[in-house]
Interface confidence: low
């Protein structure tokens, strides 16, 4: 007797109900009086649920299991497990006996999403460049154990001086605490990403630290060390500041913003007056804040072509300048998934799955995964084409040989925004019979 169960583990969220599928092929004339069905824990052989002598013998597993009585006669011996707990994780064996005897084991993988991380900083005031700070990232009540990644404002991994601990509570759910020790630069953004490896769920948080600057004798022009990230179509502020001396007046100020590479004039303030935008009429200063030393530039309706370095020149009696980078970004759309061929699929067939996501910037990173979050790297072709606005359309094609059934997920990542757009498709091939039919 052939007993069929899913090849892949069944993933269930803590607190939800799970169905452990199990089926057999009843012969003509089969009646439930002939059926003996036993579900038990594979390792300990503990009885979970049984059906014998034509009757459901009920749950032997904390009263949280049920069969599908109306479907048993059709060969559906599946088990419903209610209010799933971490302790339920493991292998369950489905034994079916009519005249012949057969059994198969199905794995239950339990999962719980992690909470959005909370971030704390120690010390959290009077910070100066060069100080060592401890940033703690805490995320709660997830399962299984998380993977924790730290990144800077550009999404570059921070691997040094990280200590991560994970503690399980009485329900078996994990609380994660990850500590990053870092020496401060002029300023910086630090992001913590807590990943659930089973759900492929990422929980992000970040903290931006702007230390105080040490005073110096000369005019010091200050800009952010890290690029300013701006979404296409939004407004961006390129921050620039100087320290006005007592008695400073705007009549003394010469302020010039220009493109660092080409030296093209962007905006200027001279002779006590705003000389206006020389950059497609999309720039403005903050006139009410200039006297306090705020020379920041507002760039409106950001385009991809704006990306690059802008230099802020300030001249009073002294002269100073500094360059700030503008990094333009646009989020990718939720991927659309297409399948070719898309019907009459059988295990062993080769299918082509196309994942398309539109109008993002900069170029995306594309990852394919199966239903358990295992990366699929073979036979993937990805193309990215920029449109007239410089935004990219991404098309990624995965060629795969079908198993009994399967879920295929495409993840399109914007490396600057650290934004992930997901799409997935579940393919259920018609079941094979063994031996194969002629």
């Amino acid at each position: 007797l052939e007993v069929q169960v899913p090849e892949d583990p069944v993933v269930a969220l803590v607190g939800t109900d799970a169905t452990l599928c199990c089926s057999f092929s009843p012969e003509p004339g089969f009646s439930l009086a002939q059926l003996n069905l036993i579900w038990q824990l594979t390792d300990t052989k503990q009885l979970v649920h049984s059906f014998a002598e034509g009757q459901d013998q009920g749950s032997a597993y904390a009263n949280r299991t049920a069969l599908f009585p109306d479907l048993l006669a059709q060969g559906n011996a599946s088990l419903r497990l209610q209010r799933v707990r971490v302790a339920d994780e493991g292998s369950f064996t489905c034994f079916v006996s009519i005249r012949d005897f057969g059994s198969a084991a199905v794995s239950l993988q339990v999962a719980a999403p992690y909470s959005k991380p909370s971030m704390t900083l120690e010390p959290n005031k009077d910070l100066r460049p060069g100080d060592t700070v401890t940033i703690t990232c805490s995320s709660y009540q997830g399962y299984p154990e998380a993977e924790v990644f730290w990144q800077d404002g550009q999404g570059v991994p921070l691997t040094g001086n990280v200590t991560t601990s994970q503690m399980a509570n009485e329900q078996g759910l994990f609380d994660v605490h990850s500590i990053l020790r870092v020496v401060l630069g002029a300023n910086g953004t630090y992001s913590c990403l807590v990943r659930n490896p089973v759900l492929q769920q990422d929980a992000h948080s970040s903290v931006t630290i702007t230390p105080q600057r040490s005073p110096t004798g000369a005019v010091e022009v200050q800009v952010p060390e890290d690029p300013v990230v701006a979404l296409v179509g939004t407004d961006a502020t390129l921050r620039c500041s100087f320290s006005p001396e007592p008695g400073f007046s705007l009549a003394q100020l010469n302020l010039i913003w220009q493109l660092t590479d080409t030296k093209q004039l962007v905006h200027s303030f001279t002779e006590g007056r705003d000389q206006g935008s020389a950059y497609a009429n999309r720039t403005a200063l903050f006139p009410d804040l200039l006297a306090q030393g705020n020379a920041s530039l507002r760039l409106q309706r950001v385009r991809v072509a704006d990306e690059g370095s802008f230099t802020c020149f300030v001249s009073i009696r002294d002269f100073g300048s500094a360059a700030v980078s503008l990094q333009v970004a646009a989020p990718y759309s939720k991927p659309s998934m297409t399948l070719e061929p898309n019907k009459d699929l059988r295990p062993g067939d080769t299918v082509t799955i196309t994942c398309s996501s539109y109008r993002g910037y900069p170029e995306a990173e594309v990852f394919w995964q199966d239903g358990q979050g295992v990366p699929l790297t073979g036979n993937v072709t990805t193309s990215q084409m920029a449109n007239e606005q410089g935004l990219f359309d991404v098309h990624s094609v995965l060629r795969v040989v079908l198993g009994a059934n399967g879920t295929y997920s495409c993840l399109v990542r914007n490396p600057v925004l650290q934004q992930d757009a997901h799409g997935s498709v579940t393919i259920t091939g018609q079941p094979m019979t063994f031996p194969p039919e002629a």
Partner: antibody
Framework: EVQLLESGGGLVQPGGSLRLSCAAS????????MSWVRQAPGKGLEWVAG???????YYADSVKGRFTISRDNSKNTLYLQMNSLRAEDTATYYC????????WGQGTTVTVSS | QSVLTQPPSASGTPGQRVTISCSGS????????VHWYQQLPGTAPKLLIY???RRPSGVPDRFSGSKSGTSASLAISGLQSEDEANYYC???????????FGGGTKLTVL
């Protein structure tokens, strides 16, 4: 396809200077940390210098004060300016993406000899 | 003399499992993630294992990495003749503020 292509190597006398270039393609260059690594003939790998995407720089003690790493994001190019060259700087120089070099170039050879 | 210590050579027969060690200190392996590189004769090195135990796409699952305390290991199971190469470990060093490579291990398949 992600590619890195080094150039600028050659024969130079002790005390001389040389500038290596590394042209990047197939990825968003400005978003990535970059590095230079060298390998003397018959020897192991030695990390030389690295530059963050925000242009902060790091150097091995053996080249500090003599070598300068820089980048031009508009040209998708990484540079290594090498001054006061010594015989022990003779090596194949590789550029790579990230400090941990997930992608390598094919290398360019620098020979310091009189 | 490298701060990260590797055995200069290792060997094994086809099908065997071979382990290459990399020993450091609390300033490097103790607090940072480890990367491994393979350099076949006459070619540029390639990243084999990153972030201590992750494989880039295209690297067979015969290669695995691990770390314990101030030491790291690269394991190769089901050894094949094409695995004959030099293997290097590397990590960041907090005291030197630079990236370090080990001295390298020449693996011979007998």
């Amino acid at each position: 396809e992600v590619q890195l292509l080094e150039s600028g190597g050659g024969l130079v006398q002790p005390g001389g200077s040389l500038r290596l270039s590394c042209a990047a393609s197939g990825f968003s260059f400005s978003n990535y940390d970059m590095s230079w690594v060298r390998q003397a003939p018959g020897k192991g790998l030695e990390w030389v210098a690295g530059i963050r995407s925000g242009s902060r720089t790091y150097y091995a003690d053996s080249v500090k004060g003599r070598f300068t790493i820089s980048r031009d994001n508009s040209k998708n190019t990484l540079y290594l300016q090498m001054n006061s060259l010594r015989a022990e700087d003779t090596a194949t120089y590789y550029c790579g993406r990230y400090f941990n070099m997930d992608v390598w170039g094919q290398g360019t050879t620098v020979t310091v000899s009189s | 003399q490298s701060v990260l210590t590797q055995p200069p050579s290792a060997s094994g027969t086809p099908g065997q499992r071979v382990t290459i060690s990399c020993s450091g200190s609390t300033f490097n392996i103790g607090t940072n993630l480890v990367h491994w590189y393979q350099q076949l004769p006459g070619t540029a090195p390639k990243l084999l294992i990153y972030l201590t135990d992750r494989r880039p796409s295209g690297v067979p699952d015969r290669f695995s990495g691990s770390k314990s305390g101030t030491s790291a290991s690269l394991a190769i199971s089901g050894l094949q003749s094409e695995d004959e190469a030099n293997y290097y470990c590397a990590t960041w060093d907090d005291s030197l503020n630079s990236f370090l490579f080990g001295g390298g291990t020449k693996l011979t398949v007998l």
